[in-house]
């Protein structure tokens, strides 16, 4: 009886089960009653990452430097090229098809998490006792200066954007 279902890594064609081509190879011709499935390795800059019956291999992804992309991992016959972004940039999507400049944290906000090639800068508002007076993609919120430890007193209170201003203590007259 002709099969209605085939084993893993096989496919049904013309009432018979044929072996799929292994990753890194494409289908040249289906099996027959006399021959096995004929497969050929993918060419340079091509890949197939699954057991398959594809007649064409996929092209490796191109990491376009004009889009801020560079190669993170070179593709093989079984894997696609993995792109990442140049320093200071991050991917706009999981597929990393283009890059955007890392966001900077405005004054009053500090960097909670520095950006990577795949994620943007995460900012957080500076809490009481901390400040940031610059727009930066790296600077965290800094603690206000402790006037007391310097034997000084606060002359001007700090904000989320400015440090405290310390001054000498008033002398008793």
């Amino acid at each position: 009886e002709p099969p209605t279902a085939c084993r893993e890594k096989q496919y049904l064609i013309n009432s018979q089960c044929c072996s799929l081509c292994q990753p890194g190879q494409k289908l040249v011709s289906d099996c027959t009653e006399f021959t096995e499935t004929e497969c050929l390795p993918c060419g340079e800059s091509e890949f197939l990452d699954t057991w398959n019956r594809e007649t064409h291999c996929h092209q490796h992804k191109y990491c376009d430097p004009n889009l801020g992309l560079r190669v993170q991992q070179k593709g093989t016959s079984e894997t696609d090229t993995i792109c990442t972004c140049e320093e200071g940039w991050h991917c706009t999507s999981e597929a990393c098809e283009s890059c955007v400049l890392h966001r900077s944290c405005s004054p009053g906000f500090g960097v909670k998490q520095i950006a990577t090639g795949v994620s943007d800068t995460i900012c957080e508002p500076c809490p009481v006792g901390f400040f940031s007076n610059v727009s930066s993609a790296f600077e965290k919120c800094h603690p206000w200066t402790s006037c007391e430890t310097k034997d000084l007193v606060v002359q001007q209170a700090g904000t989320n954007k400015t440090d405290v201003v310390c001054g000498p203590q008033d002398r008793l007259r």
């Epitope: 040249v28 011709s29 099996c31 027959t32 009653e33 006399f34 021959t35 096995e36 004929e38």
Partner: antibody, heavy 117, light 107 residues
Framework: EVQLVESGGGVVQPGRSLRLSCAAS????????MSWVRQAPGKGLEWVAS????????YYPDNVKGRCTISRDNSKNTLYLQMNSLRAEDTAVYYC??????????WGQGTLVTVSS | EIVLTQSPATLSLSPGERATLSCRAS??????LHWYQQKPGQAPRLLIY???QSISGIPARFSGSGSGTDFTLTISSLEPEDFAVYYC?????????FGQGTKVEIK
């Protein structure tokens, strides 16, 4: 018991035709692909033709394509090989074989074809 | 066309000895190779299929190995009835091709 019995061989002049037959028994003939393989005197094995179980698909090497035709009659459990424009180099024992698991799992005893003037 | 080259052409051994026959393919054929035995005046018979799979009714002293381009048929201990010609055959792609054969003869 699987049996393959070839017939139709003999002496034939160059340029003439010959039809070989293979009578199959002991298995469901219509479920199996079949092939012809030949062996020139004192030489190795050479594949000549194959036909799918239903008879829809046929396969030949380049050196016999156009001169040989493989066919089958599933109602008669018989395989055929029609050979035309015979040459001296076609002289050989012709074996009928069954395709089981993509192997030639059963062979007939062979029939000798001699092409000579 | 895939060319199969068998070596040696002739192997002269004594009963009880181990026989190692080689078959090399001109390109990778994965494990798509069969081995056949032919005794004088007889039709060939299938010994090993898919390079290493044993056939029911074939003595366990016959074994096959290899994948890609290099294949081996081993007869662990030769019996008098094993002296014959051995052929490899590929079924990876059309046309089906055989090796030229290795004759195992009594020394």
């Amino acid at each position: 018991e699987v049996q393959l019995v070839e017939s139709g061989g003999g002496v034939v002049q160059p340029g003439r035709s010959l039809r070989l037959s293979c009578a199959a028994s002991g298995f469901t003939f219509s479920n199996y692909g079949m092939s012809w393989v030949r062996q020139a005197p004192g030489k190795g094995l050479e594949w000549v033709a194959s036909i799918s179980s239903g008879g829809d698909d046929t396969y030949y090497p380049d050196n016999v394509k156009g001169r040989c035709t493989i066919s089958r009659d599933n109602s008669k459990n018989t395989l055929y090989l029609q050979m035309n424009s015979l040459r001296a180099e076609d002289t050989a024992v012709y074996y009928c074989t069954r395709a089981g698991g993509k192997a030639m799992d059963y062979w007939g005893q062979g029939t000798l074809v001699t092409v000579s003037s | 066309e895939i060319v199969l080259t068998q070596s040696p052409a002739t192997l002269s051994l004594s009963p009880g000895e181990r026989a190692t026959l080689s078959c090399r393919a001109s390109q990778s054929i994965r494990d798509n190779l069969h081995w056949y035995q032919q005794k004088p005046g007889q039709a060939p018979r299938l010994l090993i299929y898919y390079a290493s799979q044993s056939i029911s009714g074939i003595p366990a002293r016959f074994s096959g190995s290899g994948s890609g381009t290099d294949f081996t048929l081993t007869i662990s201990s030769l019996e008098p009835e094993d002296f014959a010609v051995y052929y490899c055959q590929q079924f990876n792609s059309w046309p089906l091709t055989f090796g030229q054969g290795t004759k195992v003869e009594i020394k």
